[in-house]
């Protein structure tokens, strides 16, 4: 699941990790664009063991996953509101 949130009013990530997380262990990804009280883009990953980690948006591996998700979502009909279900 890829989620884009524009509603929060502050940064939520205190610390960011660039450590690789394989796709198979990722449950969903939340992207908070820059603005609305936070000066930077934030990427929050929920893992399948229920733990949560903030990922450095510059990490090469997360960029690859995001690109894959974008390609998938552009080839399927849009889902309403802010969520996209991606297998």
């Amino acid at each position: 699941v890829l989620e884009v949130y524009y509603t929060h009013l502050r940064c939520r990530c205190v610390q960011e990790s660039s450590v690789f997380i394989p796709r198979r262990f990722i449950d969903r990804i939340q992207i908070s664009p820059r603005g609305n009280g936070c000066p930077r883009k934030e990427i929050i990953v929920w893992k399948k063991n229920k733990s949560v980690v903030c990922v450095d948006p510059q990490a090469e591996w997360i960029q690859r996953i995001m690109e894959m998700l974008r390609k998938k979502s552009s080839s399927t009909p849009p889902v309403p509101v802010f969520k996209r279900k991606i297998p």
Partner: antibody, heavy 123, light 106 residues
């Protein structure tokens, strides 16, 4: 040469507990995630558990969650699987495997396996 | 959960011949599939990862292909040491193995 040697299998009664061990050598154990996989008497392979290189992240399928616990001791190069509330359907050959995912360009899943240790759950 | 349907469950072929095994996933697994060879008394041996990448030391007689939900694995120029059971594994969403294919030589 990568070597994984499992031990600790045996016969246990339903509801009982057992702890499996896997001794690793031939690679930097602390740099790799590790998994347990079992082969049922019907020869089906089933993933049982995975633990990250540092041991902070663990993953389980629903059928063992809450009953099995994977752990590791990086100082001793050992991997463990604590099994409790055992059921007859847990009867299997249990393998430990190295789980190699260095980066998105180097994701091999389970690349080296041990020879297994047999667990029989029966009254 | 992703299901992996592997077929056939067993097959018999002649030395020097070619065999193909297929695995169909219940959803797109984005090429995250490996193939293993398993012989009695040993642990499975990784042959191919990420659909088609051969592991070091594995002969080029072994090959894999596929995308989306459909994947295949082939062995050409069959040799006696190829007698084994072969399994696919999806690792796109946790892990699921196929049911296995037992290969025998005629």
């Amino acid at each position: 040469e990568v070597q994984l040697v499992e031990s600790g299998g045996g016969l246990v009664k339903p509801g009982g507990s057992l702890k499996l061990s896997c001794a690793a050598s031939g690679f930097t154990f602390s740099s790799y995630a590790m998994s347990w996989v079992r082969q049922t008497p019907e020869k089906r392979l089933e993933w049982v558990a995975t633990i990250s290189d540092g041991g902070s992240d663990t993953y389980y399928p629903d059928n063992v969650k809450g009953r099995f616990t994977i752990s590791r001791d990086n100082a001793k190069n050992n991997l463990y699987l604590q099994m409790s509330h055992l059921k007859s359907e847990d009867t299997a050959m249990y393998y430990c495997a190295r789980d190699y995912y260095g980066s998105s360009y180097e994701d091999y899943a389970m690349d080296y396996w041990g020879q297994g240790t047999s667990v029989t759950v029966s009254s | 959960d992703i299901q992996m349907t592997q077929s056939p469950s067993s097959l018999s072929a002649s030395l020097g011949g070619k065999v193909t095994i297929t695995c169909k996933a219940s959803q797109d697994i984005n090429k995250y599939i490996t193939w293993y060879q398993h012989k009695p008394g040993k642990g499975p041996r990784l042959l191919i990862h990420y659909t088609s990448t051969l592991q070091p030391g594995i002969p080029s007689r072994f090959s894999g292909s596929g995308s989306g939900r459909d994947y295949s694995f082939s062995i050409s120029n069959l040799e006696p040491e190829d007698i084994a059971t072969y399994y696919c594994l999806q690792y796109d969403n946790l892990y699921t193995f196929g049911g296995g294919t037992k290969l025998e030589i005629k």
